[in-house]
């Protein structure tokens, strides 16, 4: 289960996003936005830094279906 | 051939300073996590520090202040400089290549392990 | 921290003999989990990665399984060249951690 504000690396922050991201999948990079030239991946920003809930779920790989 | 090489391993005297450095060869260095793990006489194996390519960093609570380790992507060499060094930091330190930056390869495929060992340096702290 | 846990600490077999060590993980490292061989005055040797999987160049008699805490290393028909110490190492979180060691001697 996730656990909010602590930093996920390894095989912690993979289960992680498989649990929170389910059938979806995800990914460890996202594209570079216009706003900013270099875009960080999920190492970056969970495993040497707290993560939320709301990051990880950027590193889906499509967006979850609204019933 | 891919290979890791450890330098400047020797004695000191307790409170004393050594830099250690691995030289890289036969693989993209600046792709890698890198690893320093030590293993006392007649001991096991411990973890001391990990380096992430792009310099990030993660240490073992016993050398926490006291080792830095980083790394020259330019010159493919990675380094731990250990400070204060304790008679219970007398050990065979080995330099190793963890798995990729962010752990997947190109095809999808999760990796995470210690794959290429460099041959070791022995450092003894004694007075 | 997650502690790994070795047994035995050593045992005696005979070459062709199989031979198990287990490894356990004081919680959950799902399949995150590593074997290494090490022979006396040289590095460790990755065997084993991610549980089950045989890294490129070691013979098909060694293989591995388990998940969750409890993992096991098998070596089905033991060579001559097997004598060595053999440690686990969870690959899950930091700090990584290895287990204490089997050192598997001849009898």
């Known amino acids: 289960a996730y656990r909010p504000s602590e930093t996920l690396c390894g095989g912690e922050l993979v289960d992680t996003l498989q649990f929170v991201c389910g059938d979806r999948g995800f990914y460890f990079s996202r594209p570079a936005s216009r706003v900013s030239r270099r875009s960080r991946g999920i190492v970056e920003e969970c495993c040497f830094r707290s993560c939320d809930l709301a990051l990880l779920e950027t590193y889906c790989a499509t967006p979850a279906k609204s019933e | 051939e891919v290979q890791l090489l450890e330098s400047g391993g020797g004695l000191v005297q307790p409170g004393g300073s050594l830099r250690l450095s691995c030289a890289a060869s036969g693989f993209t260095f600046s792709r890698y996590w890198m690893i320093w793990v030590r293993q006392a006489p007649g001991k096991g194996l411990e973890w001391v520090s990990s380096?992430?390519?792009?310099?990030?960093?993660k240490y073992a609570d016993s050398v926490k202040g006291r080792f830095t380790i980083s790394r020259d992507n330019s010159k493919n060499t990675l380094y731990l400089q250990m400070n204060s060094l304790r008679a219970e930091d007398t050990a065979v330190y080995y330099c190793?290549?963890?798995?990729?930056?962010?752990?997947?390869?190109?095809?999808?495929?999760?990796?995470?392990?210690?794959?290429?060992w460099g041959q070791g340096t022995m450092v003894t702290v004694s007075s | 921290d997650i502690q790994m846990t070795q047994s035995p600490s050593s045992l005696s077999a005979s070459a062709g003999d199989r031979v198990t060590i287990t490894c356990r993980a004081s919680q959950s490292i799902s399949s995150y989990l590593n074997w290494y061989q090490q022979k006396p005055g040289k590095a460790p040797n990755l065997l084993i990665y991610?549980?089950?999987n045989l890294q490129g160049g070691v013979p098909s008699r060694f293989s591995g399984s388990g998940s969750g805490t409890d993992f096991t290393l098998t070596i089905s028909s033991l060579q001559p060249e097997d004598f060595a110490t053999y440690y686990c190492?969870?690959?899950?979180?930091?700090?990584?951690?290895f287990g204490g060691g089997t050192k598997v001697e001849i009898k």
């Open positions: 991610t549980t089950s």
């Open positions: 190793a290549r963890g798995p990729l930056s962010d752990y997947y390869d190109s095809s999808g495929y999760y990796f995470d392990a210690f794959d290429i």
């Open positions: 190492q969870q690959g899950y979180s930091f700090p990584l951690t």
């Open positions: 380096i992430r390519s792009s310099g990030e960093t």
